[in-house]
C-alpha cells in the first residue's frame, strides 16, 4: 500500500506569451498520493470547468486557452489539493501580444491658415506600438510646429499652405506594421488684398481703371462698392491664375467718389473679407476739398469698427500728419481707458468716442463731418456715465488725473448742436438698454411747428451698429 | 455743487402778470437748457417751455403760446418765466428744472403763485 | 402733442409688496421717458431715465421698462419711504409731456 503523499507542483507555471487568436497553454505537473484535484483561477476567480474557451485535460494538469483574446491578459495559478496537507499553487502571466492595429485612423481635414490642426491616429498593440507619419511619400520630421502627440494624433499649430497634402499614419511593433488610409489636409487661406486700388485725382469726364489683386484659397471673389453702394455704372473684368484674383474696374468719373475693393471666400459656414478703398477726385474741386481741413473715407480702423455703420464714410482730420492713423491712436487710448469703466457706462462711451472722433461725414464738393447731437453727449456723461464724469471732473479739479475717462477725446456737449434744431446737423447716437434685456432704437418723428432753436424732435438721419449683438437705427 | 434757487412767492389779481426767476449757480450756465413746470394745487406736473440759455431760444407748449416769455440773463446767470393774463387756475407752483430728460436731475425750489380777486 | 397716460390714477399697497405702474404714449416715443417720484411738498425726484436707467443714489428695487407706447415702472418690494405720487415724462419731442401721474397709498 503507498502511503499518501501531499502535492508537489513540479513544472511550476512559466510566463506565457500568446498572439490574439493563437492558442495558449500553461503546464503544471503534480506529484501527489492519491492524485490531487487541480483547479484553475484567473486573476485570483475560479476557471468553470464547462467554459468552452478553455480545454482541461492530463487530470487538469493543462490549461489550454483555445483562442486568446486581447482580455485574457492576467494572472494564471493551478491549485493541488488532494487531502494531504495543505493546497499547493503556481502562478504564471499570459501576456496577450498583438500587432498593431489603428482603432481611429485619421480623416480629411480642411484648416483656416494659421490654426491648429489635429489629425487623429489612435492604435492598439502589444508592445505598444510607436506612430509615425507619412505626407506624400516621405516621413514626416517633428519640428516646433509639428508633432506626434503621445496618443499618436499629428497635431500641426499655426498650419501653413505648404502643410497641404496627403498624409497616413504608421503604427508598428515588434509584431507587424499597419498603416492607415490616405488622408487629404486642405488648408484654407483668408481672403487677403495683394495690391490695392490706387487713388486718382482727375478731370471731369475722364475714364479711370482701379485694379484690385487678391488671393485666398478658395479663390475669393471680388466686389466693388462706391461710396458705400454697389456700383451703379462702370465695367468689371476679372481674370483669375495661381489663386490669385485680379479685378479691374473701368469708370467714367462726373463726380468724385469712395470706391472700395471687397474680397471675399467662404470657409464652411463663415466668410472672410478683405477691404480696400480708393478715392477718385475731381482735379478742380481740390481747392475747396482743401479748405474743409479734412476728407471723407471709409473707416478701415478696428477699434471702432462694431460701433460705426457698415461702409459709412467717415471725416478725417488733415490738420494731423496721417490722419487716419492719429485718430485711431486717440480711439485706441480712449478704449484702453474704458476698461476701466462700468458695464452701463462702456456702450454708451464707445458710441459717443468713436461718432465723435470719426465724425459721419457727407462726401460733397467740401466734405462736411456731422457732430454728435448734444442731447445725446449729455446722457451719456450725466447719465450713463454720472459716477465717472463725477470722478473725473473732481480729479481734474485737484489736478490728480486717474479716472478710467481722464485720457478721453471727448467732445464739450454744449458746443454740439441740437438735436431739436436741425435732424442734419448732427449725428444721434444709439443707446442701449442698459440692462441688455431688449435692442433699443429710435424713431422717426416727423417735426410739426418749427421754434428757433428747438422745434419737436427730428427724423433720425443716421444708422449704426453698435456692436455683434446690438443694431439699432 | 449745482443749485437753482427761485424767487419767493407771489400774489397777484386775475389779468396781471408775473415773472418769476431762477437764479443757476455751480456749472456753465449757458451749457444746458432750462424747462418751466408748474403744478396746481392737488394737480400734476405740467410742461410749460424750453430755453436755451446761449441764444436766447425758446420752445413753449401750445397751451402757454402767446401769454408766457422764457428769457434769460448771462451776466447773472438767471432764467425768467414771466406769465400774462393770469386766471385763477394759473395758482400752481412753477418749477425750473435743468435738463429734465437729457441730462443730470436739478430741480428749482418752487415758486407758488396765488392767482384771486 | 403725445399725450401720455398712467395707470392706475390712485393705488394703495403694503409694504413688501411689488407694485407696478404703467405709462402709454400716444405715439412711438422710443425709449425717451423718464419716471418721477414727488412727495408732498417736495419738489419731483427722477427714479429713471431712458426707459431704464437707473438714477444714481436710487435704490436698486426701482426698475423702468418698456419702448415704443408701453412702459412700466416696477417697485420691487415696497417700503415705507416709497409711498407718493409718481409721474412718467416723455422727452421724445416737444412739448414734452407728462402722465396724469399715480398716487400711491398705505394699504
Known amino acids: 500500500e503507498k502511503l499518501p503523499k501531499a502535492p508537489v507542483i513540479t513544472t511550476p507555471l512559466e510566463t506565457v506569451d500568446a498572439l490574439v487568436e493563437e492558442v495558449a497553454t500553461f503546464m503544471c505537473a503534480v506529484e501527489s498520493y492519491p492524485q490531487p484535484e487541480i483547479s484553475w483561477t484567473r486573476n485570483k476567480i475560479l476557471i468553470k470547468l464547462f467554459d468552452t474557451r478553455y480545454s482541461i485535460r492530463e487530470n487538469g494538469q493543462l490549461l489550454t486557452i483555445l483562442s486568446v483574446e486581447d482580455s485574457d491578459d492576467g494572472i494564471y495559478c493551478c491549485i493541488a489539493n488532494n487531502g494531504v496537507g495543505g493546497a499547493v499553487e503556481s502562478c504564471g502571466a499570459l501576456q496577450v501580444k498583438m500587432k498593431p492595429k489603428i482603432t481611429r485612423p485619421p480623416i480629411n481635414v480642411k484648416i483656416i491658415e494659421g490654426l491648429k490642426a489635429v489629425l487623429p491616429c489612435t492604435t492598439m498593440g502589444n508592445p505598444k506600438p510607436s506612430v509615425s507619419w507619412i505626407k506624400g511619400d516621405n516621413a514626416l520630421r517633428e519640428n516646433s510646429r509639428i508633432a506626434v502627440l503621445e496618443s499618436g494624433s499629428l497635431r500641426i499649430h499655426n498650419v501653413q499652405k505648404e502643410d497641404a497634402g496627403q498624409y497616413r499614419c504608421v503604427a508598428k511593433n515588434s509584431l507587424g506594421t499597419a498603416y492607415s488610409k490616405l488622408v487629404k489636409l486642405e488648408v484654407e487661406v483668408f481672403a487677403r488684398i495683394l495690391r490695392a486700388p490706387e487713388s486718382h485725382n482727375v478731370t471731369f469726364g475722364s475714364f479711370v481703371t482701379l485694379r484690385c489683386t487678391a488671393i485666398g484659397i478658395p479663390v475669393p471673389t471680388i466686389s466693388w462698392i462706391e461710396n458705400g453702394n454697389a456700383v451703379s455704372s462702370g465695367s468689371i473684368q476679372e481674370s483669375v491664375k495661381d489663386r490669385v484674383i485680379d479685378s479691374r474696374l473701368q469708370l467714367f468719373i462726373t463726380k468724385p467718389g469712395l470706391y472700395t475693393c471687397i474680397a471675399t471666400n467662404k470657409h464652411g459656414e463663415k466668410f472672410s473679407t478683405a477691404k480696400a478703398a480708393a478715392t477718385v477726385s475731381i482735379a478742380e474741386w481740390s481747392k475747396s476739398q482743401k479748405d474743409s481741413q479734412g476728407y471723407c473715407a471709409q473707416y478701415r480702423g478696428e477699434v471702432c469698427d462694431a460701433v460705426l455703420a457698415k461702409d459709412a464714410l467717415v471725416f478725417f482730420n488733415t490738420s494731423y500728419r496721417d490722419p487716419e492713423d492719429a485718430q485711431e491712436l486717440l480711439i485706441h487710448t480712449a478704449w484702453n481707458e474704458l476698461k476701466a469703466v462700468s458695464p452701463l457706462c462702456r456702450p454708451a462711451a464707445e458710441a459717443l468716442l468713436c461718432n465723435h472722433l470719426f465724425q459721419e461725414c457727407s462726401p460733397g464738393v467740401v466734405p462736411t463731418p456731422m457732430p454728435i447731437c448734444r442731447e445725446y453727449c449729455l446722457a451719456v456723461k450725466e447719465l450713463f456715465c454720472a459716477k465717472e464724469w463725477q470722478a473725473m471732473e473732481g480729479k481734474a479739479h485737484r489736478g490728480l488725473y486717474r479716472s478710467g475717462m481722464h485720457l478721453l477725446p471727448v467732445p464739450e456737449c454744449s458746443k454740439l448742436p441740437s438735436m431739436h434744431r436741425d435732424p442734419t446737423a448732427c449725428t444721434r447716437l444709439p443707446y442701449l438698454d442698459y440692462k441688455k434685456e431688449n435692442i433699443t432704437t429710435f424713431p422717426s418723428i416727423t417735426s410739426s411747428r418749427p421754434s428757433a432753436d428747438i422745434p419737436n424732435l427730428p427724423a433720425s438721419t443716421s444708422s449704426f451698429a453698435v456692436s455683434p449683438a446690438y443694431s439699432m437705427t | 455743487q449745482v443749485q437753482l434757487v427761485q424767487s419767493g412767492a407771489e400774489e397777484k389779481k386775475p389779468g396781471a402778470s408775473v415773472k418769476v426767476s431762477c437764479k443757476a449757480s455751480g456749472y456753465t450756465f449757458t451749457n444746458y437748457y432750462m424747462h418751466w413746470v408748474r403744478q396746481a394745487p392737488g394737480q400734476g406736473l405740467e410742461w410749460m417751455g424750453i430755453?436755451?440759455?446761449?441764444?436766447?431760444?425758446?420752445s413753449y407748449a401750445q397751451k402757454f403760446q402767446g401769454r408766457v416769455t422764457m428769457t434769460r440773463d448771462t451776466s447773472t446767470s438767471t432764467v425768467y418765466m414771466e406769465l400774462s393774463s393770469l386766471r385763477s387756475e394759473d395758482t400752481a407752483v412753477y418749477y425750473c428744472?435743468?435738463?429734465?430728460?437729457?441730462?443730470?436731475?436739478?430741480w428749482g425750489q418752487g415758486t407758488l403763485v396765488t392767482v384771486s380777486s | 402733442d403725445i399725450q401720455m397716460t398712467q395707470s392706475p390714477s390712485a393705488m394703495s399697497a403694503s409694504i413688501g409688496d411689488r407694485v407696478t405702474i404703467t405709462c402709454r404714449a400716444s405715439q412711438d416715443i422710443s425709449n425717451y421717458l423718464a419716471w418721477f417720484q414727488q412727495k408732498p411738498g417736495k419738489v419731483p425726484k427722477r427714479l429713471i431715465y431712458v426707459a431704464s436707467g437707473l438714477q444714481s443714489g436710487v435704490p436698486s428695487r426701482f426698475s423702468g421698462s418698456g419702448s415704443g407706447t408701453e412702459f412700466t415702472l416696477t417697485i420691487s418690494s415696497l417700503q415705507p419711504e416709497d409711498f407718493a405720487t409718481y409721474y412718467c415724462l416723455q422727452h421724445n419731442s416737444y412739448p414734452f409731456t407728462f402722465g396724469q401721474g399715480t398716487k400711491l397709498e398705505i394699504k
Open positions: 430755453i436755451n440759455p446761449s441764444g436766447g431760444n425758446t
Open positions: 428744472a435743468r435738463e429734465l430728460g437729457w441730462g443730470s436731475d436739478y
